[in-house]
C-alpha cells in the first residue's frame, strides 16, 4: 500500500525566514511529486513532476523529503498539497500542509464618530491589515477593557452593545448617555507586540427636537 504523509501538518514561521514543508511517501517505485498552493480563490502549482515551476524556482527547492523555501513572505500563507503518483501507474496519495507566515499586527485604524445620537445605533470599527494570522480586537473605553458581553461587568451594565473581536466592529444599539467616552482598540494575533490605535472621543448627544 502507498502512504503520503507529513509529520508537520501545520507550520508557523515568522516572515522572511526559511522553511521546509515535509512530504514523506512510500510504496511508489517511480514517484511523481507535485505540490499545489491554495489560498482563497488562488491556486498555483509550485512543483510539477518533481520540478519547481518557473514562478517559484528562484526561492523554492525540491527535495525528496519536501520543498524548502529560502525565505517566506505573508503571501505564502495558505495550504500546500503534496500529491504523489506512480509514474505511468494508478497509485496516488496526497497530504495537505498548512503554512502560516507570522506577521505582527500593525497599528489599527479606528473609525469612531465624534458624536452620535442617544437612542440610535452607533457603529465603531477597528482594523489592521498586516497581522498574520489575522488579529483579534479588544476595545477600550476610557482605558478600561470592554467585555464581549456588557452585562458581565458592572462598569458596562448600563450599555447595550455587540462587540465582535474577529471583525473589530463595536455596535451600540441603542446608544445611551453613559456611552460617552474615549475609545481605542488593540489588535493582537499571538505573534509580536499587540498594537493600540489612537484614542478618539465619542459624545453621546440628545436628539435635536424641533420646536
Amino acid at each position: 500500500s502507498v502512504t503520503v504523509h507529513s509529520s508537520e501538518p501545520e507550520v508557523r514561521i515568522p516572515e522572511n525566514n526559511p522553511v521546509k514543508l515535509s512530504c514523506a511517501y512510500s510504496g511508489f517505485s517511480s514517484p511523481r511529486v507535485e505540490w499545489k498552493f491554495d489560498q482563497g480563490d488562488t491556486t498555483r502549482l509550485v512543483c510539477y513532476n518533481n520540478k519547481i515551476t518557473a514562478s517559484y524556482e528562484d526561492r523554492v527547492t525540491f527535495l525528496p523529503t519536501g520543498i524548502t523555501f529560502k525565505s517566506v513572505t505573508r503571501e505564502d500563507t495558505g495550504t500546500y498539497t503534496c500529491m504523489v503518483s506512480e509514474e505511468g501507474g494508478n497509485s496516488y496519495g496526497e497530504v495537505k500542509v498548512k503554512l502560516i507566515v507570522l506577521v505582527p499586527p500593525s497599528k489599527p485604524t479606528v473609525n469612531i464618530p465624534s458624536s452620535a445620537t442617544i437612542g440610535n445605533r452607533a457603529v465603531l470599527t477597528c482594523s489592521e491589515q498586516d497581522g498574520s494570522p489575522p488579529s483579534e480586537y479588544t476595545w477600550f473605553k476610557d482605558g478600561i477593557v470592554m467585555p464581549t458581553n456588557p452585562k458581565s461587568t458592572r462598569a458596562f451594565s448600563n450599555s447595550s452593545y455587540v462587540l465582535n473581536p474577529t471583525t473589530g466592529e463595536l455596535v451600540f444599539d441603542p446608544l445611551s448617555a453613559s456611552d460617552t467616552g474615549e475609545y481605542s482598540c488593540e489588535a493582537r494575533n499571538g505573534y509580536g507586540t499587540p498594537m493600540t490605535s489612537n484614542a478618539v472621543r465619542m459624545e453621546a448627544v440628545e436628539r435635536n427636537v424641533g420646536v
Epitope: H5, S7, V19
Partner: antibody, heavy 116, light 106 residues
C-alpha cells in the same frame, strides 16, 4: 552506508552552555532534516527540535525554545545542538537522528553531565 | 501535543514467551507509529514503522498492529538478545515517544 557520528562526552557547570556535534555521511546531508532527541537517566526519549540543513530553517520543542540552538554546516555535513543555561536536570544523553518521517538513523549519543 | 501512554513500564518473561507491549495515543494518529529497540549504552534502533512495516533485517518475530489510538507491539517468541527497552514513537503530528518498556528474562 548512513552514519551519524557524535562528539564526545561533556561535563559542564550549572549555567554554562554545551555544544554537541553530529557528523553525517553516506547520504545527501541537505535532503533530510536532522533532529535532536535527549534521554535523561531513567526517562523517556524527548524530542528537542530539528534543522533543515538545506536552508537552515529550524523548529524547536516549546519546552526548549529559547535555550536550544540547532545549526548546520553543509560544507562538513555536520549538525550542531547548543543548549544554554544548563541545570542539573539537563544531565542526559543527547542524540541526533535523521528524519524521513520517523527517525531512521541515529547517532551513538553524547552524554552531557551537569554538575557543580 | 499528542501524548503517548506506553504499558507496561517493565515486564519479565521466559525465553520463547510471547511478549506484548501497548501504546495509547491521546488522539487518532492514523497508524503513524514506529517502534524502537534500545539496548543499554546504545542508540535506539528502528524496528517497525507505519504500525506494522518491518525494517529490513529485523527478525519476523517482531510485529506491530493497531489503529486509531491503540497500538500493539509483539515479540512472538522472546529470545535472549531481545533484552532491551522498547519505545513507541508517534509521528502523525510532530514527534512524541512513549515512556518505554523494559523487557527482562525470567
Amino acid at each position: 552506508q548512513v552514519q551519524l557520528v557524535q562528539s564526545g562526552a561533556e561535563v559542564k557547570k550549572p549555567g554554562a552552555s554545551v555544544k554537541v556535534s553530529c557528523k553525517a555521511s553516506g547520504y545527501s546531508f541537505t535532503d533530510y532534516s536532522m533532529h535532536w532527541v535527549r534521554q535523561a537517566p531513567g526517562q523517556r526519549l524527548e524530542w528537542m527540535g530539528y534543522i533543515d540543513p538545506y536552508n537552515g530553517g529550524t523548529r524547536y520543542s516549546q519546552k526548549f525554545q529559547g535555550r536550544v540552538t540547532i545549526t548546520a554546516d553543509t560544507s562538513t555535513s555536520t549538525a550542531y545542538m547548543e543548549l544554554s543555561s544548563l541545570r542539573s536536570e539537563d544531565t542526559a544523553v543527547y542524540y541526533c537522528a535523521r528524519q524521513t518521517d520517523y527517525f531512521d538513523y541515529w547517532g551513538q549519543g553524547t552524554l552531557v553531565t551537569v554538575s557543580s | 501535543d499528542i501524548q503517548m501512554t506506553q504499558s507496561p513500564s517493565s515486564l519479565s518473561a521466559s525465553v520463547g514467551d510471547r511478549v506484548t507491549i501497548t501504546c495509547q495515543a491521546s488522539q487518532d494518529i492514523n497508524n503513524y507509529i514506529a517502534w524502537y529497540q534500545q539496548k543499554p549504552g546504545k542508540a535506539p534502533k528502528l524496528l517497525i514503522h507505519y504500525t506494522s512495516t518491518l525494517e529490513t533485517g529485523v527478525p519476523s518475530r517482531f510485529s506491530g498492529s493497531g489503529s486509531g489510538t491503540d497500538y500493539t507491539f509483539t515479540i512472538s517468541s522472546l529470545q535472549p538478545e531481545d533484552i532491551a527497552t522498547y519505545y513507541c514513537l508517534q509521528y502523525d503530528n510532530l514527534w512524541t515517544f512513549g515512556q518505554g518498556t523494559k523487557v527482562e528474562i525470567k
